[in-house]
């Protein structure tokens, strides 16, 4: 799998999309996991609804939401109020039994907020009842890693 880079701005929301073959993955729940080290396990962050027919409903874990368009074949993950510690390598997965197929490897990069010189008191964050799309969603910048690029910094 190639790795796709998604860039977002600190304090804003980043939307990650993972396209897949809707027929091949028919009836399968999906998940978003974080890669722990270059060869470490992928730790589950959030998964789609327990009932596959309700996969389109948002599922949350903290500030991360997942929703699945099972007809169109697009899994969407929203990382709300993006923070530097959110940067790293992730995977979109398709689940079947105890197994998981990788749909896409994703490198999340967090850019500095151009407004971060302002006092924190001047910054506004949307409340729960407000629509995060309408507040702080940036159109994510994505690209595939070039051959030879390393998603993890080299370890000594």
């Amino acid at each position: 799998h190639n790795t796709t880079v998604f860039q977002g701005v600190a304090g804003q929301s980043l939307q990650v999309s993972c396209p897949y073959d809707s027929m091949k993955h028919w009836g399968r729940r999906k998940a978003w996991c974080r890669q722990l080290g270059e060869k470490g396990p992928c730790q589950r962050v959030v998964s789609t609804h327990n009932l596959w027919l309700l996969s389109f409903l948002r599922r949350w874990n903290g500030s991360t939401a997942i929703t699945d368009d099972t007809l169109g074949g697009t899994l969407t993950i929203t990382l709300r109020n993006l923070q530097p510690h959110d940067a790293g390598l992730y995977q979109c997965q398709s689940l079947h039994g105890s197994e998981a197929d990788t749909l896409r490897k994703v490198l999340v990069e967090v850019l500095a907020d151009p407004l971060d010189h302002r006092d924190a008191g001047d910054l506004w964050f949307p409340g729960e009842s407000e629509s995060f799309e309408d507040a702080h969603v940036e159109h994510s910048i994505s690209r595939s890693l070039l051959e030879g690029e390393i998603p993890f910094p080299p370890t000594s």
């Epitope: 327990n50 009932l51 409903l57």
Partner: antibody, heavy 117, light 107 residues
Framework: EVQLLESGGGLVQPGGSLRLSCAAS????????MSWVRQAPGKGLEWVSV????????YYADSVKGRFTISRDNSKNTLYLQMNSLRAEDTAVYYC??????????WGQGTLVTVSS | EIVLTQSPGTLSLSPGERATLSCRAS???????LAWYQQKPGQAPRLLIY???SRATGIPDRFSGSGSGTDFTLTISRLEPEDFAVYYC????????FGGGTKVEIK
């Protein structure tokens, strides 16, 4: 601010039909799943149906399956509930609701449907 | 379907007292998908708690939620006059369902 306004309720005879509407504003309507929830007079809440943001996927409670149809027109920011073969036990206030941290995070004020001869 | 049983059906308390409301599920529910709502006469329900223990925006900190598995609790630490209402729990871990409600009335 999220605003949901239901309309279309009224008195209908058993076996009749009615279409409820819910006009939405204050958010990107097409990005959210929407539900209908009902409440019979003096009773508790009963979830009825939900539709995906695109309108391509729907799901129903067993009590209304085959009789009710949920739909939406994203160009009009409007949610609908077509109710056919109505029964006395369908008498209730019908609320539309927007998903958020829960399936029914924000609610409208409701519209009353009375099924009686 | 998952049946949610709320108890007691009615709770008679005085302002300033502590209210403890129970919601029991017929099978295990992920705490991430257990919510509590408040409803006053003639009004729509209002979300109080989501994820079993997280307060929704604008909800006072006298409201708290706890629990896991099949047993969940909503606690109102000190009842204010505006807190007398009906409270519902809801799960959407599976097909969505509501509990039957608990009425908190003035003693």
């Amino acid at each position: 601010e999220v605003q949901l306004l239901e309309s279309g309720g009224g008195l209908v005879q058993p076996g009749g039909s009615l279409r409820l509407s819910c006009a939405a504003s204050g958010f990107t309507f097409s990005s959210y799943a929407m539900s209908w929830v009902r409440q019979a007079p003096g009773k508790g809440l009963e979830w009825v149906s939900v539709i995906s943001g695109s309108g391509g996927s729907t799901y129903y409670a067993d009590s209304v399956k085959g009789r009710f149809t949920i739909s939406r027109d994203n160009s009009k920011n409007t949610l609908y509930l077509q109710m056919n073969s109505l029964r006395a036990e369908d008498t209730a206030v019908y609320y539309c609701a927007k998903e958020g941290r829960t399936i029914t995070m924000d609610w409208g004020q409701g519209t009353l449907v009375t099924v009686s001869s | 379907e998952i049946v949610l049983t709320q108890s007691p059906g009615t709770l008679s308390l005085s302002p300033g007292e502590r209210a403890t409301l129970s919601c029991r599920a017929s099978q295990s529910v992920s705490s991430s998908y257990l919510a509590w709502y408040q409803q006053k006469p003639g009004q729509a329900p209002r979300l109080l708690i989501y994820g079993a223990s997280s307060r929704a925006t604008g909800i006072p900190d006298r409201f708290s939620g706890s629990g896991s598995g099949t047993d969940f609790t909503l606690t109102i630490s000190r009842l204010e006059p505006e807190d007398f209402a009906v409270y519902y729990c809801q799960q959407d871990d599976r097909s969505p369902t509501f509990g039957g409600g608990t009425k908190v009335e003035i003693k």
